[in-house]
């Protein structure tokens, strides 16, 4: 889904009732530590020498909702995610590097602690390089492992 296109339907008010306290995870993993802003995430990544995983999504996108569920329920992904600085965004940042091939959702982009966007770590869709679907969890897991192999090790 291209985020420049507005969804035709608004959520029913009943959908807005919180089932759990709202956290920065927005449902992507309540046991994980999430950063609040891109700037904070970059700082944490650089100072902790951990890669950053940025998830762009929208509450009103069926594919964001579907990917969120499998991501949150995938034990191996959740465990591996502990080694990342994590950020999920429901808005676009001004950094064009986070949308190398467009502002669609859901998309997942990795950033090295050297603050280099890992444009080389892509999904399986040629028209949306950083998109993942629920059936792509094995590929996402492999890509997370790839992102953990840093471009250069800080001494």
């Amino acid at each position: 889904k291209d985020t420049t296109v507005k969804s035709g339907a608004k959520k029913d008010p009943k959908d807005s009732r919180p089932k759990l306290p709202q956290t920065l995870s927005r449902g992507w993993g309540d046991q994980l530590i999430w950063t609040q802003t891109y700037e904070e995430a970059l700082y944490r990544s650089k100072t902790s020498n951990r890669p950053l995983m940025v998830i762009h999504h929208l509450d009103e996108c069926p594919h964001s909702q579907a990917l969120k569920k499998v991501f949150a329920e995938h034990k191996e992904i959740q465990k591996l995610a502990e080694q990342f600085v994590l950020l999920n965004l429901v808005y676009e940042t001004t950094d064009k590097h986070l949308s190398p091939d467009g502002q669609y959702v859901p998309r997942i982009v990795f950033v090295d602690p050297s603050l280099t966007v890992r444009a080389d770590i892509t999904g399986r869709y040629s028209n949306r390089l950083y998109a993942y679907e629920p059936s792509d969890t094995a590929l996402l897991y492999d890509n997370m492992k790839k992102a953990l192999k840093l471009l250069k090790t800080e001494l």
Partner: antibody, heavy 120, light 107 residues
Framework: QVQLVQSGAEVKKPGASVKVSCKTS????????MNWVRQAPGQGLEWIGW????????NYNGKFKDRVTLTADKSTSTVYMELSSLRSEDTAVYFC?????????????WGQGTLVTVSS | EIVLTQSPATLSLSPGERATLSCKAS??????LSWFQQKPGQAPRTLIY???RLVDGIPARFSGSGSGQDFTLTISSLEPEDFAVYYC?????????FGGGTKVEIK
């Protein structure tokens, strides 16, 4: 094998509510989206909404506003669709339809349908 | 909401002939389109998802193609049991929407 078995036909008066059930088996209930779709006599198909049984998250077609409620009972692997303030134009066959086996949104398996007739 | 327009409304063909059904979306829906077959008094049956992926158990004579706004369902050689109504569905955006259907009838 995957099975979706819906409750029987209902006749309701205008203004009343109806609750249709869809009992599932043959797959991990909590990890596939469940959609509800309706079809008025001689008409096409209309999406009502979906629910994720794992946590109860829902999204509804805005057309139904506050009239529809989707719920799931994990203990019996059953989903429910309740429609209130019924009117004659709600007369239709109501279907439950499971999402993809891997949690994807596409509709894979369908229940047999439940006819709801609204008549005074 | 996204509008799906199916054409033709009715297709009159003989067994053994090739059927080509069209579904056009009012905006880009990537490849998030499914096709269903429905016979009178029955629930729909899913044939194709993600525009071109055949559901397990569906005969190979059914195939789907297209992306963006234009999609096609092709039945390479019609069998007697293929005469039915066919619907497309977009699941790119809420609310999911169906096309109006194409009836494939015996000529």
């Amino acid at each position: 094998q995957v099975q979706l078995v819906q409750s029987g036909a209902e006749v309701k008066k205008p203004g009343a509510s109806v609750k249709v059930s869809c009992k599932t088996s043959g797959y991990v209930f909590s990890r596939s989206w469940m959609n509800w779709v309706r079809q008025a006599p001689g008409q096409g198909l209309e999406w009502i909404g979906w629910i994720y049984p794992g946590d109860g998250d829902t999204n509804y077609n805005g057309k139904f506003k506050d009239r529809v409620t989707l719920t799931a009972d994990k203990s019996t692997s059953t989903v429910y669709m309740e429609l209130s303030s019924l009117r004659s134009e709600d007369t239709a066959v109501y279907f439950c339809a499971r999402g993809g086996y891997d949690g994807s949104p596409w509709l894979s398996y369908w229940g047999q349908g439940t006819l709801v007739t609204v008549s005074s | 909401e996204i509008v799906l327009t199916q054409s033709p409304a009715t297709l009159s063909l003989s067994p053994g002939e090739r059927a080509t059904l069209s579904c056009k979306a009012s905006q880009d829906i990537n490849s998030y389109l499914s096709w269903f077959q429905q016979k009178p008094g029955q629930a729909p049956r899913t044939l194709i998802y993600r525009a071109n992926r055949l559901v397990d158990g569906i005969p190979a004579r059914f195939s789907g193609s297209g992306s963006g706004q234009d999609f096609t369902l092709t039945i390479s050689s019609l069998e007697p049991e293929d005469f039915a109504v066919y619907y497309c569905l977009q699941y790119d955006e809420f609310p999911f929407t169906f096309g109006g259907g194409t009836k494939v009838e015996i000529k």
